[in-house]
């Protein structure tokens, strides 16, 4: 689940079994010149950044929930 910082794909691997309880925010990065794939980077309650699998149904659910809560705030 390491997150790199250079101008390339930031997610070297993704975490399995992520739970929404400790996710403070989610950043969805669309494919671009720096990286050919969609990347989902979550910031956890303790400040740690973790890469999530954008194809995972639970991750899709988490992103949807986060976007909906952003809209209602």
């Amino acid at each position: 689940a390491s997150v790199a910082t250079e101008l390339r794909c930031q997610c070297l691997q993704t975490l399995q079994g992520i739970h929404p309880k400790n996710i403070q925010s989610v950043n969805v990065k669309s494919p671009g010149p720096h990286c050919a794939q969609t990347e989902v980077i979550a910031t956890l309650k303790n400040g740690r950044k973790a890469c999530l699998n954008p194809a995972s149904p639970i991750v899709k659910k988490i992103i949807e929930k986060m976007l909906n809560s952003d809209k209602s705030n």
């Epitope: 689940a1 975490l15 399995q16 079994g17 992520i18 739970h19 309880k21 400790n22 979550a42 956890l44 309650k45 303790n46 400040g47 740690r48 973790a50 639970i58 659910k61």
Partner: antibody, heavy 119, light 107 residues
Framework: QVQLQQSGAELVRPGSSVKISCKAS????????MNWVKQRPGQGLEWIGQ????????NYNAKFKGKGTLTADKSSSTAYMQLNSLTSEDSAVYFC????????????WGQGTSVTVSS | DIQMTQSPSSLSASLGGKVTITCKAS??????IAWFQHKPGKGPRLVIH???ILQPGIPSRFSGVGSGRDYSFSIRNLEPEDIATYYC?????????FGGGTKLEIK
């Protein structure tokens, strides 16, 4: 390596209070939720509640609200649970357990503290 | 609160054999189930989380499957050190709730 060291066994009187401790080492104590779990003799496990030492945030099982109070001391990396107005129903082994940050699985547990309520 | 119904409450099996324990949740728990091994005088040990992910250091003889409300946990090639009580735990919704436990004995 991660370790959770709990305080020793307690023999207490009905109606009194007890405070048990769980000293954490081997990780950033402030950054992980600490859970507390009860096991009565010959019975299963019951989740009491949890505390996030970083900001003092707590979640309680409604069944234990008012019975147990969770606190944490960041300077000593120690979590505490105070049990009030003790009755024989509170005689049990109490465990602390760290909750992993990303998937909330309880991955490390203390050895348990036995509390016996008896007159 | 979500209820977790675990069965059987006890079982006896032969060394080298296979056992399966089931847990049924009172509602969909989105695969957020963990399985613990508990031996007397010790703290419980996390074996599997998120339905099927094995904890580091746990032998591949242990496995878990399930979705929705129905989940199961299996141990194959039973060894003497597997004697323990096993619990499921749902952590989809607070309060976290455990199943009643399954005491495993060797014949």
């Amino acid at each position: 390596q991660v370790q959770l060291q709990q305080s020793g066994a307690e023999l207490v009187r009905p109606g009194s209070s007890v405070k048990i401790s769980c000293k954490a080492s081997g990780y950033a104590f402030s950054d992980y939720w600490m859970n507390w779990v009860k096991q009565r003799p010959g019975q299963g496990l019951e989740w009491i509640g949890q505390i996030y030492p970083g900001d003092g945030d707590t979640n309680y099982n409604a069944k234990f609200k008012g019975k147990g109070t969770l606190t944490a001391d960041k300077s000593s990396s120690t979590a505490y649970m105070q049990l009030n107005s003790l009755t024989s129903e509170d005689s049990a082994v109490y465990f602390c357990a760290r909750e992993r940050d990303y998937d909330v699985a309880m991955d490390y547990w203390g050895q348990g503290t036995s509390v016996t309520v008896s007159s | 609160d979500i209820q977790m119904t675990q069965s059987p409450s006890s079982l006896s099996a032969s060394l080298g054999g296979k056992v399966t324990i089931t847990c049924k949740a009172s509602q969909d728990i989105n695969k957020y189930i963990a399985w613990f091994q508990h031996k007397p005088g010790k703290g419980p040990r996390l074996v599997i989380h998120y339905t099927s992910i094995l904890q580091p250091g746990i032998p591949s003889r242990f496995s878990g499957v399930g979705s929705g409300r129905d989940y199961s946990f299996s141990i194959r090639n039973l060894e003497p050190e597997d004697i323990a009580t096993y619990y499921c735990l749902q952590y989809d919704n607070l309060p976290w709730t455990f199943g009643g436990g399954t005491k495993l004995e060797i014949k």
